[in-house]
Structure formats: structure tokens, C-alpha cells
Interface confidence: low
């Protein structure tokens, strides 16, 4: 047994680029020529445990053999030198690992950056895979002075181990080298302060002020080095609820500075606020953003009055009349505030006026058949809003003028309402609506209008499939004028039911059918038509479509004492509905008529 | 949502003259940077011109400098880029680019949040 190899594998770590030829050549030693009566026309050379096939093989000599590979992409090969020992027993004489890939490409897009606080980091793109163990090493030197070098572990970038030295230029490249060759980036020269990328400013505050709701001030730590450099900042807000970031403009905000007031901003409202800085020539990196701070700008009196509206109780000729006065809670963007109260002002037409403080949205007050003039603001705590005036006309003024064309449409998951206006100069529109229905009272909403607008879209909660009664009335500065109403649906869908049909009259060959009216709450849409199937037995169905405003229909050329099966279907714009089945027979005879 | 539709591109000669435009639309135009971005198939996306909304100050690659002007029309909603003296390497696709939280005028394409679908400008000799 021969315990040294019995020859080698020349090269022994062999590394070929991807795409070009290989040979590798197998030396016998004498001694295992001798030992196991072979020459090198016995090696048998393998790769991943398959045989080379022959023609890849050539015999040198009697100790040597050659195998070339065309075109090697494989990353990795076992390459093995085995021999038929006494002509048939196979022998592994040696082996040896072939790597395939490419030389580095030049790294490019060399950057580096001084994270405040931590040695300088420089990234570069390395080019394409080499599928080999390629080293990487930043190069840094002064015109005077070579840096230690920064071996990368990640093949993209390096920390170097020294603090930068700052206001003296370095040169800085990047080597990378490995079984198939070397190359260097192109270098680049800079001062490590131009690279800073400052710690983000902290201690962030936001303060009000009572004298202008519209401004919030800032105040900020900065860093810089501990003060070695001068900061620019950048600072960016959003409301509480938005997602998007406004920004303050860059040319407000250049000059150094640790504090800011914000101005143009709603009253009453919360704020979120963050901000970050860089060197003030704009060289280096902006820091990340502070941690967010809120602030809540200062209240201001409310910069519209509610809308504004009223319903008469009926006063069955008495001398009084009960009146609702209704208003809506203001937005909060117009609110500004925390609402505290509501200001009534009743002004009968010869009389002093009465006031009501009112912390809800409504006033029922008895008023007696004159003419009243009504005035509401709403007060917080810096002031009250400009107020919304309604006149309310005695009950014997017949109102005139309402608006035509009225319409209404569903588009965009909302139902749209408009009108032409009245000739008559308004001082705004009441629009109300409530879901018609047999088995609960009409509970109305309303929204109000400016008189510039004629077409809008009802805002409250409305459900799909149930009919909306919905009416506009104009407002003048005289009062009301006189309401419109139509009925519309946000979505219709096929009817809940479909008719129930009896029999009004038969007759020998015919027949009267009735119906009534399916009900509103399963109507579902409008009723557009009818159906009627009708057959016998054995006879094939007819089918008869009938206009919606009918209750009745004739079936005529009916065959006599016959059993008839009906039914009905009523449809709307999305579909139809059958009603139950209906049968009624045919007198043998006409009323009079003898066999 | 915010929506960014370019129209203008087209072909024409050597030393010729096109309008892109781009009107915006989704997000409050006054607090943008507005881009111009053209393409080469194979090649990356390269800036051309930037415009700030609300300041007007503007940026220009070196490559059109003179050539170019990138100018606005606030009310429409609408950032335009006049091209004057066109080579044969204006060619490509141009796109409109838009950012509403970037500091300064750049044409850094990383920086824009809201992209066009692109016009494609073609100059022959």
C-alpha cells in the first residue's frame, strides 16, 4: 500500500474566468508506475464523480496526462485524476477543486459620509458578481500621509477604524482583488466636513400663543459637532390626522437658528411638527428627521355662524304657534374652538327682543302669528361667530317662488340633488330628506346651502334601497319661498316581494286581474313595469309586460272552463321580483248562454 | 389619488423645437418640485430639469442647459419644458416626475415620489 500520493494535479487550486478554456495536467510518480504496472494511459479523469469523456483527454508521456474544458461556467468542479490499478481496479490518485467566475470590475459611485459621532463610512458599487472570494479594501491617504487600509466585509462598503480629521482634503479609492486580478476605483478628494451627516436636532418644542391663532413656535437643540458647525434646517408639519408633510420653505429656514414660528396656520388645530438639519453651504447629508413634536394652535372666535333653520308646528288658528328653531354644530375647521354656546336672538316686527343662551343644537319657542326676525351665533372662548339670520314670516304669507328642474341622481356612491334657481335674488337653499316608509314616520335631515350653489350631494348617512323624499326650499332675506320635493334612491335593487294578483271578473274568455301597489319599504326602486305569466296546464306560457301605473289588466282570448295559472313580476332598474302563483278557472259558458 | 399625464412629445428634426407639458393633478400643486426625466431604453433614467412650485427656482442637467427651459402655469395645474435646438441624443422616453417632501430643486430621481406614464420624443437627422 502506497501511503504517499501516487502523483499530483497540476495547478493545484485551479481558478479559470467563466467562458475560456482550461487544461489541467495529471504527473505520475515512477514508484506508482511501478507498483501498480500502469502508464499515463490508464488515468481516468472525472468531474463531480463523472468520467471526462475521451476526446477531452490527451497522453503526454507515459507518466502524464492532459484534459482541457471548453467554455467552463460551472462556479464549482471536483476535478479528480483516478487509474485502472492492474488494469481494471480504479484508484483515486488526486484531486483538486475548480473555481470558475471573473475578475473584479472597477468599483464605481465611491461615497462616503461622517455619521456625527462615528468614523467615516464609504460605500461604492462593485459591478457585477464574481462568484469568486474577492477582497475589498478602502484606500485613504493625505498628500502627506497614508490612512490604515479598511478591509469590507460586505464587499460594498467599509468604516474606517480612524476619527476624520476635518478642514484637510483625503484621498480616498477602493482595490479589489482576487484570483483573476486586481483594480482600482477611480479616487476621490474631499474634506470629511462636506461628508457630515449631523446627529437630528432634539429636544424639539412647539408653543402657541394667545394673541395669534394662526402661528405655532418651534425650538430645537442642534448638534453640529458640539458647535464646530454651522446648521441649516429643514422643517416639515402636518396636521394631526394627515398623512402627507407640508413644507416650510428652504429659504426661510437657511441661516443658522435654533427656533421658528410657523405661520398661516387654521386656528384649533393640532399640529405635528419635525425637523432635521444640515452644514449651512448645503455640503454633506441631511440628518434624519427629530423624533415628532405636536402643538395645538390657540383658539379663534368662530369664522362662520351655523346653519340655520326652523319647522312651524301647525297652529290650528290659534294666536300662537309653536316654532322649532335648528341649527348644525360647526366643523371644527370652522368651529376654532370649543363651542361653549349658541346666541338666539328673537326680534318680533314692533317689539324689544328676546335672547336665549343655548348649549344644544335647537329652540321650541311659542310665537304668535307676527313677523319675526331670528339671529344665531355661536361663541367660544375668544368670541362669537358673525350670525346667521332667518326671518320667519306670519302664517297668513303665502310663500313664493321655489326653485324648477329639480333632480336628483345617484353618481360616486352619493346622491346628488339639483335645481335651476328661483328669479328672485336667495339668500340660501334648505335642503331635507327622510326615507319614505309605511312602517316608521319620515325622520328628516337637512342640510344648508349658499345661494351661489345648485347642484350638491346630500351629506348625511343614507342607506341603499330605501326612497328618499327629498325637498328644497329657497331662503330669502323675507323668508322662506316655496318647497320642492321629488323622491330619488341612493341604489336601487331588484323589489323585496313582487304583486299579489286576484281575479276582479272572469269570464268565459276573459279575465279581469287586480293588484295593488307593492309597498314603499319593499319597493327597493321604482316600480318601472310589470309582468303577467299566464298558462294552463298544458299550454305554453304567455307573457304580457303592463305599465307601471296600472292596477288592472284584461286577459283576453282565454279558452273556456279552463284552469289558469298567473303569475306576477314587478321590476325595477336592477331586476325583478315574482309574486306568488294565482289560479282561477274559466266558466264552460258565457253569463246567459245555454248548452 | 395624484395623477401626473404628459402629452407634447412627438417626432421632429435636428435643431427643431417641442413643448412637453404636464398637468397635476391629486395634491396641493403651491408645495411641489416638479421634474423632467428622460429614458434610453437599456440605459438608466436620467434627470433633465426640476422646478420648484412655490418658489419657481429651477435646475438643469449640463447636458441642456441653454437648450432647455422649465417653466409653470399655476393656475392649470401645469409644469411645461420647452426644448429648443434638439440633438439626435434627446431621444427617449420623457417623463414628469413630482415630490412634496424633498428640501430643495434637484433632479436626484430617487427623490420623487409620483411618476408619469412618459411621452416619447424622437429627433432624427
Known amino acids: 500500500q502506497l501511503l504517499e500520493p501516487c502523483g499530483y494535479i497540476y495547478p493545484e487550486f485551479p481558478v479559470v474566468q467563466r467562458g475560456s478554456n482550461f487544461t489541467a495536467i495529471c504527473v505520475l510518480k515512477e514508484a506508482c508506475l511501478q507498483h501498480y504496472y500502469v502508464n499515463a494511459s490508464y488515468i481516468v479523469w472525472k468531474t463531480n464523480h463523472a468520467a471526462v469523456p475521451r476526446e477531452q483527454v490527451t497522453v503526454i508521456n507515459r507518466t502524464t496526462s492532459s484534459v482541457t474544458f471548453t467554455d467552463v461556467v460551472l462556479p464549482s468542479v471536483q476535478l479528480t485524476c483516478n487509474i485502472l490499478s492492474f488494469g481494471q481496479i480504479e484508484q483515486n490518485v488526486y484531486g483538486v477543486t475548480m473555481l470558475s467566475g471573473f475578475p473584479p470590475d472597477k468599483p464605481t459611485n465611491l461615497t462616503c459620509i461622517v455619521n456625527e459621532g462615528k468614523n467615516m463610512l464609504c460605500q461604492w458599487d462593485p459591478g457585477r458578481e464574481t462568484y469568486l472570494e474577492t477582497n475589498y479594501t478602502l484606500k485613504s491617504e493625505w498628500a502627506t500621509e497614508k490612512f490604515p487600509d479598511c478591509q469590507s466585509k460586505h464587499g460594498t462598503s467599509c468604516m474606517v477604524s480612524y476619527m476624520p480629521t476635518y478642514y484637510v482634503n483625503i484621498e480616498v479609492w477602493v482595490e479589489a482583488e482576487n484570483a483573476l486580478g486586481k483594480v482600482s476605483s477611480e479616487s476621490i478628494n474631499f474634506d470629511p466636513v462636506d461628508k457630515v451627516k449631523p446627529t437630528p436636532p432634539y429636544n424639539l418644542s412647539v408653543t402657541n400663543s394667545e394673541e395669534l391663532s394662526s402661528i405655532l413656535k418651534l425650538s430645537w437643540v442642534s448638534s453640529g459637532l458640539g458647535g464646530l458647525l454651522d446648521l441649516k434646517s429643514d422643517i416639515q408639519y402636518r396636521t394631526k390626522d394627515a398623512s402627507t408633510w407640508i413644507q416650510v420653505p428652504l429659504e426661510d429656514t437657511m441661516s443658522p437658528r435654533t427656533s421658528f414660528t410657523v405661520q398661516d396656520l387654521k386656528p384649533f388645530t393640532e399640529y405635528v411638527f419635525r425637523i432635521r438639519s444640515i452644514k449651512d453651504s448645503g455640503k454633506g447629508y441631511w440628518s434624519d428627521w427629530s423624533e415628532e413634536a405636536s402643538g395645538t394652535t390657540y383658539e379663534d372666535r368662530p369664522s362662520r355662524p351655523p346653519s340655520f333653520w326652523y319647522k312651524t308646528n301647525p297652529s290650528h288658528g290659534q294666536e300662537y304657534r309653536s316654532v322649532r328653531l335648528i341649527w348644525k354644530a360647526l366643523p371644527l375647521s370652522e368651529a376654532n374652538g370649543k363651542i361653549l354656546d349658541y346666541e338666539v336672538i328673537l326680534t318680533q316686527s314692533k317689539s324689544v327682543s328676546q335672547t336665549y343662551t343655548v348649549t344644544g343644537t335647537e329652540l321650541t319657542v311659542n310665537l304668535t302669528n307676527d313677523r319675526y326676525v331670528a339671529s344665531l351665533a355661536a361663541r367660544n372662548k375668544v368670541g362669537k361667530s358673525a350670525a346667521a339670520v332667518l326671518t320667519i314670516p306670519s302664517p297668513h304669507v303665502t310663500a313664493a317662488y321655489s326653485v324648477v328642474n329639480l333632480k336628483a341622481f345617484p353618481k360616486d356612491n352619493l346622491l346628488w340633488v339639483e335645481w335651476t334657481p328661483p328669479p328672485k335674488p336667495v339668500s340660501k337653499y334648505i335642503l331635507e330628506w327622510c326615507v319614505l316608509s309605511e312602517n316608521a314616520p319620515c325622520v328628516e335631515d337637512w342640510q344648508q346651502e349658499d345661494a351661489t350653489v345648485n347642484r350638491t350631494h346630500l351629506r348625511g348617512r343614507l342607506l341603499e334601497s330605501k326612497c328618499y323624499q327629498i325637498t328644497v326650499t329657497p331662503v330669502f332675506a323675507t323668508g322662506p319661498g316655496g318647497s320642492e320635493s321629488l323622491k330619488a334612491y341612493l341604489k336601487q335593487a331588484a323589489p323585496a316581494r313582487g304583486p299579489t294578483v286576484r281575479t276582479k271578473k272572469v269570464g268565459k274568455n276573459e279575465a279581469v286581474l287586480a293588484w295593488d301597489q307593492i309597498p314603499v319599504d319593499d319597493q327597493n326602486g321604482f316600480i318601472r313595469n310589470y309582468s303577467i305569466s299566464y298558462r294552463t296546464s298544458v299550454g305554453k306560457e304567455m307573457v304580457v309586460h303592463v305599465d307601471s301605473s296600472h292596477t288592472e289588466y284584461t286577459l283576453s282570448s282565454l279558452s273556456s272552463d279552463t284552469l289558469y295559472m298567473v303569475r306576477m313580476a314587478a321590476y325595477t332598474d336592477e331586476g325583478g321580483k315574482d309574486g306568488p302563483e294565482f289560479t282561477f278557472t274559466t266558466p264552460k259558458f258565457a253569463q246567459g248562454e245555454i248548452e | 389619488q395624484v395623477q401626473l399625464q404628459e402629452s407634447g412629445g412627438g417626432s421632429v428634426q435636428a435643431g427643431g423645437s417641442l413643448r412637453l407639458s404636464c398637468v397635476i393633478s391629486?395634491?396641493?400643486?403651491?408645495?411641489?418640485?416638479m421634474g423632467w426625466f428622460r429614458q434610453v431604453p437599456g440605459k438608466e433614467r436620467e434627470g433633465v430639469a426640476a422646478?420648484?412650485?412655490?418658489?419657481?427656482?429651477?435646475v438643469y442637467a449640463d447636458s441642456v442647459k441653454g437648450r432647455f427651459t422649465i417653466s409653470q402655469e399655476s393656475s392649470k395645474n401645469t409644469v411645461y419644458l420647452e426644448m429648443n435646438g434638439l440633438k439626435l441624443e434627446d431621444t427617449g422616453m420623457y417623463y414628469c416626475?413630482?415630490?412634496?417632501?424633498?428640501?430643495?430643486?434637484?433632479?436626484?430621481?430617487?427623490?420623487?415620489?409620483?411618476w408619469g406614464q412618459g411621452t416619447q420624443v424622437t429627433v432624427s437627422s
Open positions: 391629486g395634491f396641493t400643486y403651491k408645495q411641489t418640485f
Open positions: 416626475a413630482a415630490s412634496t417632501v424633498i428640501t430643495s430643486v434637484t433632479i436626484n430621481r430617487g427623490l420623487y415620489q409620483y
Open positions: 422646478i420648484s412650485t412655490g418658489g419657481g427656482s429651477t
